[in-house]
Structures are given as C-alpha cells and as structure tokens.
C-alpha cells in the first residue's frame, strides 16, 4: 500500500536569466528510492538513479545541474521554461510517486519564490 | 505495464557478426538504464554492459568490451545488442534487463548459436 | 571485481520444510538482490535490496544479511518453488550474479 506523500515546492516563479531549485520530498513511508526522474511536460529533463547516480539529458547538459539532494537546479532561465515540472519516484515496496510543480519565468525584476522552498 | 520484446533466434557461422533487438513498451524509454545480460548453455549470468538510451552513454563489463556493441532508439524505444567475430564461446541466451534498483523487467531471451 | 559465491550448488528438500541458501561476497556490498529463473524462462526479481520481496513473491521467502554474507530463506518449501535461485549486487561495477542455487524438491 502507498503511505507516502510527495512535498514540492508548488507554484513557483523566477526572473529571466536567473537560476531556480525543483525539489520534491518524499514522505510517510520507509520506502526505498530507487530513481528519480524529473520531466518537464513529456521531456526528460535528468535522472538521479540510487546505484548509478545523477544523468543529465544532452539538450539540457549546459543550465541544468543535479541537486541539492534529489532536487535539480534550472539555470539560465528564459519565458520558454514557464511550465509543468514533474519529479518522479521510484521506489519499493510502494511503486511510483509523482509530484508537480508550476515554474513561471517572468521578464521583470520582481519574481516571489514559492514559500515551501526557497533560493538564498 | 513494462514489456521487453526480443527479437527471435539466430543461427549465425564462427566470424561473423549479429544484431539482436530489444523494444520497450510500458514506460519513458529514454530516462532508465538498459542492460544486456548473457547465459551459457547449463550457465549463470554475466552482465554484459548497459546503456541510457537518452544520450547513448554505455558503459562495458571490460571481459566483453571489444566483443559487444550497445545502441539505442529513442524513436523507436529499441535497445540493441551486437556481438562481433564469433566463436563457439559466443553461443548462449542473451537477455535485456530494465535496471531500477535491480533488474525488474527482462525480455524473454534471444537465442544465439554460433555453429559452422 | 567482487565474486559472488552461493551455497549448495544443490539444495534437495521436502514439501513444508523450511532451507536457507547463502550467497558471500569476495568484498563487502551494500545490499543483494535475489532472482528466480525456471527452465526456459527468464529471471524473475524475487527480493530486492536484501530483503524486500518483488511483488507477488510469497510471503514464506525472506531475505537477509549484510556485508559480505546473505541468505535467502523459505520457511515452508512448496512444489512451485523448484528453480534456481542467483543473487547479484550492484555495490561496484561491474554488476555480478552468483553461480546459482538449484533447489529441487524430493
């Protein structure tokens, strides 16, 4: 049965060119984390696989760095990055975890961070 | 749910080479490591390599690195397994394997006899 | 790279009674993962990370150790449990199964 539940940092927004941190936090349960897979929209974004470690795909290698922790660092943002963020887990006994996150860029000076989370 | 589809048998001659295929189905292909695992006749396993078909990036056991090449598709959610010059020692059940903490899924074998 | 060794090659036991098989390690390893595999079928992911059972694995398997020693246990050995049985870790690459254990029932 899956007791767990997956904290994110929710709705979210930042400045064009700036950096944001994605993270989730898994919950409630003593399952073992197999992989995390973050996706935005159907588009693997990176995976951090518990025996492999962290594997950026190609078209993101240059803005995206793993962590903190199982979270991911989004750089060099443009208006193109307003979106869905999914963080994907992988675990067992319990199966899959999926928890969503909203991103808005935004072009003023003036962008407020989700309250859950937040870049220093 | 996962499916690993394998292509069929294959009778091949000592020095040649074969391609054996692997289509997923079930899941986002291109973001879980795939494997190729090999069984002798009478056998155990021996993990040959994997692969991430999101980038290509391989990785080779070093005993069959110069023996094995692994591809992918994202296109078409196909793995591939080609084994050069071979001998006798080649003939066996070659598996793929879906790597998530543990080989969770694997295909059903592709038989390979080297025979002259 | 690290050797996995299991013991017996062989197990012979009896419907309801209950064996261990042992797997040991050449180097320490964080964890074991257990398979089965039947004749002329694939392996199957029957205990993951020491002693979590795979979904629909009975619950009379249990798996333990830690280090360099693990064992896989069936406390009331059933006809359908006739297979061979390979650990395998992935702790350091690369990846190593076991030789296998046969478990035949009398």
């Known amino acids: 049965m899956m007791t767990g539940t997956i904290e994110t940092t929710g709705n979210i927004s930042a400045e064009k060119g700036g950096s944001i941190i994605l993270q989730c936090h898994l919950s409630s349960t003593t399952a073992q984390v197999t992989q995390v897979n973050w996706e935005q929209q159907d588009q693997l974004l990176a995976i951090c696989n518990a025996d492999l470690g962290w594997h950026i795909s190609p078209s993101f290698k240059d803005r995206v760095a793993p962590g903190p922790g199982l979270g991911l660092t989004l750089q060099s943002l443009t208006v193109n990055d307003t979106g869905e963020y999914f963080c994907i887990y992988h675990t067992y006994p319990d199966g899959t975890y999926t928890g969503r996150i909203f991103l808005e860029v935004l072009e003023s000076s003036v962008a407020e961070h989700g309250a859950r989370f937040q870049i220093p | 749910q996962v499916q690993l589809q394998q292509s069929g048998p294959e009778l091949v001659k000592p020095g040649a080479s074969v391609k054996i295929s692997c289509k997923a189905s079930?899941?986002?292909?291109?973001?879980?490591?795939m494997n190729w695992v090999k069984q002798g006749p009478g056998k155990g396993l021996e993990w040959i390599g994997r692969i991430f078909p999101g980038d290509g990036d391989t990785d080779y056991n070093g005993k069959l690195k110069d023996k094995a090449t692994l591809t992918a598709y994202k296109s078409s959610s196909t793995a591939y397994l080609q084994l050069s010059s071979l001998t006798s020692e080649d003939s066996a059940v070659y598996f793929c394997?879906?790597?998530?903490?543990?080989?969770?899924?694997w295909g059903q074998g592709t038989l390979v006899t080297v025979s002259a | 790279q690290i050797v996995l060794s299991q013991s017996p090659a062989i197990l012979s036991a009896s419907p309801g009674e209950k064996v261990t098989m042992t797997c040991r390690a050449s180097a320490s390893v964080s964890y074991m993962h257990w398979y089965q595999q039947k004749p002329g079928s694939s392996p199957k992911p029957w205990i993951y990370?020491?002693?979590n059972l795979a979904s629909g694995v009975p619950a009379r398997f249990s798996g333990s150790g830690s280090g360099t020693s693990y064992s896989l246990t069936i406390s009331r050995v059933e006809a359908e449990d006739a297979a061979t049985y390979y650990c395998q870790q992935w702790s350091s690459d690369p990846p190593t199964f076991g030789a296998g254990t046969k478990l035949e029932l009398k």
């Open positions: 394997a879906r790597w998530l903490g543990g080989f969770t899924s």
């Open positions: 990370a020491t002693s």
């Open positions: 079930g899941y986002g292909f291109s973001g879980y490591w």
